[in-house]
Amino acid sequence: GITSINCSGDMWVEPGEIFQMGMNVSIYCQEALKHCRPRNLYFYKNGFKEEFDITRINRTTARIWYKGFSEPHAYMHCTAECPGHFQETLICGKDISSGHPPDAPSNLTCVIYEYSGNMTCTWNTGKPTYIDTKYIVHVKSLETEEEQQYLASSYVKISTDSLQGSRKYLVWVQAVNSLGMENSQQLHVHLDDIVIPSASIISRAETTNDTVPKTIVYWKSKTMIEKVFCEMRYKTTTNQTWSVKEFDANFTYVQQSEFYLEPDSKYVFQVRCQETGKRNWQPWSSPFVHQTSQETGKRNWQPWSSPFVHQTSQTVSQVTAKSSHEPQKMEMLSATIFRGHPASGNHQDIG
């Protein structure tokens, strides 16, 4: 931009150098050149000479008018045509910006990733503002009434050391720019309810050579949380439909989950967990790929109607990826329930 230009006059913008996108804008240029009575005053936008809607107000001043200015940024400068000068003479320049006041931040979520030592809050910022916009995160203790504020750009990590005095907080986000301010809805947070267990990892898988081969998937987490509820989703690499199994897990030892899968197929497994009864899920773990062994006696096999599906305290359901381009976005299509209640409807990816 033109920030350190030596002006021989002045340039100003109405309604201001930062204005709401779509507004009508007037830009004025006033020369104060020595030894020059300009024949003409010219306006340039981003280096290109403007031809239309220019008015000469008096000997020293001209104005250019823009109807419904909608460019986020422009570099304006004006020049004078001085008699006897071969080149135009620079008068002044200005950076101008147009944008929108911020939307109210929405979908405010705060979580504590186990062992991180931070409460991480995220939100949706809404439509682009095109101008510098700050986010102020307010954290108010419901017990001591003390309020803290944090400046953020799109998320904030707040050390749990600064949240020692209380367990219950009110959190909200203020979006601020030069065109306006909006507040999010307030979020009630209890620190004990927002912990997400330490990452779950699938470490290995093996398929047995039994008459009915079974695949055992081994998975673990370093979590110290006692009651953990997990989902494992799995599908062949050629399929778009995931099956989901639910587990109550105790990570004092490595978890083993048994599956009766189609032979000679490549499967993808992912797992995620949450503290039992809480709402925040881990992101799905990294995809773990396992090739099942070939079977001698072939049969037409359906993993969700087979009598060989291992049934313990799990629920199995199906979810289908919306498109092959978005394998992580899940939508519940149908649920074939083997036991207990349907799988959690919250099958979208968090991570």
Epitope: T3, E17, I18, D95, S97, I131, D132, T133, K134, I136, Q148, Q149, Y150, L151, A152, S153, V156, K157, S162, V176, N177, S178
Partner: nanobody, 116 residues
Amino acid sequence: QVQLQESGGGSVQAGGSLRLSCAASGYTYSSCTMGWYRQAPGKERELVSMLISDGSTFYADSVKGRFTFSQENAKSTVYLQMNSLKPEDTAMYYCGCATLGSRTVWGQGTQVTVSS
């Protein structure tokens, strides 16, 4: 850690003017997003004005056209020029230094009282 010290408050009649100053000391001042805030008795602290970026300043609707935020980088000082003061402007005024991801640091505040 930055330290902030406000001054310039006082009592004034409605329609009068005051100029608040906030002097910052400490090595982090240059990375501060500076703002003026106020807290009236029994109310939440509210943002009055904030320097968003070069040439871009936020003003609360209630003070737009009456208050002007300015800064003098060489002196690490920011100002709030308050004109056409109203009784509802009566509050404790604080300047704040906010840096990304860190807790906002406040000054001790300066009292502004506007009588009708």
